[in-house]
Interface confidence: medium
Amino acid sequence: FRNDKCGDTIKIESPGYLTSPGYPHSYHPSEKCEWLIQAPDPYQRIMINFNPHFDLEDRDCKYDYVEVFDGENENGHFRGKFCGKIAPPPVVSSGPFLFIKFVSDYETHGAGFSIRYEIFKRGPECSQNYTTPSGVIKSPGFPEKYPNSLECTYIVFVPKMSEIILEFESFDLEPDSNPPGGMFCRYDRLEIWDGFPDVGPHIGRYCGQKTPGRIRSSSGILSMVFYTDSAIAKEGFSANYSVLQSSVSEDFK
């Protein structure tokens, strides 16, 4: 689901996107847009990720900017004021609300921004962001059987122009034996994208015991979404990722 209105109240039913109006081509001058993102249950939290194609006029964020507040309005805990061409880091709310405010002045403009919002899952190691140059991504409970009815999002963020290499050490999900090659993976599956989920090029859909090959992502973002159904659990997966770039230690400082 995509929301490109200038302001709205969004009650999350499934992951979706909100964008500055006109994105990615241009936003208008003299805009003031406010979005309230609300989790369906009071105990849930919200995670937002900014698309790396982020472009707001960069003059100390005096004129064009997007602000994020942890709460129902501008009185909530201030999480940041952002502008320029570098996408802000992900934000996870402390409660069931996030408030986002976008302001533009009367002249210079840019492409704007796109935000993916979703419920931040409290489950063990479910829905995590990774920003270190290397790491291990495991399904919940690995190597024990994973829980049922999961939707876990794993996103690796690295500097632009870096290449992410993902290699699976172990992979065992409930198979889908009916379609040829198990390509549908109707029961439990791992989806991988070069970029944000449902946005970047889709690398593949995996299930059963066929380990995904060596996965490369060149966009600076690698996303995986792990879905499980309500029955039959396997041990899941464990994967190592690393970043290929000579100056990687500098970029991560």
Epitope: R2, D4, K5, C6, T19, P21, G22, Y23, P24, H25, S26, H28, P52, H53, H109, A111
Partner: antibody, heavy 119, light 107 residues
Framework: EVQLVESGGGLVQPGGSLRLSCAAS????????ISWVRQAPGKGLEWVSS????????YYADSVKGRFTISADTSKNTAYLQMNSLRAEDTAVYYC????????????WGQGTLVTVSS | DIQMTQSPSSLSASVGDRVTITCRAS??????LAWYQQKPGKAPKLLIY???SRASGVPSRFSGSGSGTDFTLTISSLQPEDFATYYC?????????FGQGTKVEIK
């Protein structure tokens, strides 16, 4: 003078490929998005794809997603539309257009290049 | 996707007439609307952007209005060079979509 010039159109068989070029002069590709828009004979305008300046983020119409690829070579100030698996319904005049930075719309257009998909 | 519907699809008018073309969006697009003029065998030309701002070099007889879902292009006094097809375009969101066009013919 700000100008866009398309080339690369022609007759191609269904299933074939073609690469269109859009050469710009008078402005830099690195700062302004470029779009491709097509017009089938006797029909209206249809947006096909856009690429954003320096970062090269790409956007496609559903009708061409997976078959067409937009790209830009900023050193040559040229945008490209690689068209694969062409179908009869892709027959159209293809225009490239600049998305203005100060003007909210496609403010500069090329003259168009005709692509005919027929056996 | 946002659908754009123009009316009428064609109209006949005389030089000096006031001509109005309307464009309706299937959902609110704020003022993210542009109007283009196209003559046979030529590329489109941007007339209006932001629903009401005239592009550089466009004569003052062309004006745009509207916000939300309903928009209007008005030619206050039709000139011989204005006989053409006019398209509206929304750029609120991708995919960018055009209206089907309105052909302005000589009566």
């Amino acid at each position: 003078e700000v100008q866009l010039v398309e080339s690369g159109g022609g007759l191609v068989q269904p299933g074939g490929s073609l690469r269109l070029s859009c050469a710009a002069s008078g402005f830099s590709f690195s700062s302004e998005p470029i779009s491709w828009v097509r017009q089938a004979p006797g029909k209206g305008l249809e947006w096909v794809s856009s690429i954003t300046g320096k970062n090269g983020y790409t956007y496609y119409a559903d009708s061409v997603k997976g078959r067409f690829t937009i790209s830009a070579d900023t050193s040559k100030n040229t945008a490209y539309l690689q068209m694969n698996s062409l179908r009869a319904e892709d027959t159209a005049v293809y225009y490239c257009a600049r998305w203005g930075k100060k003007v909210y719309g496609m403010d500069v257009w090329g003259q168009g290049t005709l692509v005919t998909v027929s056996s | 996707d946002i659908q754009m519907t123009q009316s009428p699809s064609s109209l006949s008018a005389s030089v000096g007439d006031r001509v109005t073309i309307t464009c309706r969006a299937s959902q609110s697009i704020s003022s993210y609307l542009a109007w283009y003029q196209q003559k046979p065998g030529k590329a489109p030309k941007l007339l209006i952007y932001g629903a009401s701002s005239r592009a550089s070099g466009v004569p003052s007889r062309f004006s745009g209005s509207g916000s939300g879902t309903d928009f209007t292009l008005t030619i206050s006094s039709l000139q011989p060079e204005d006989f053409a097809t006019y398209y509206c375009q929304q750029y609120m969101s991708v995919p960018i979509t055009f209206g089907q066009g309105t052909k302005v013919e000589i009566k």
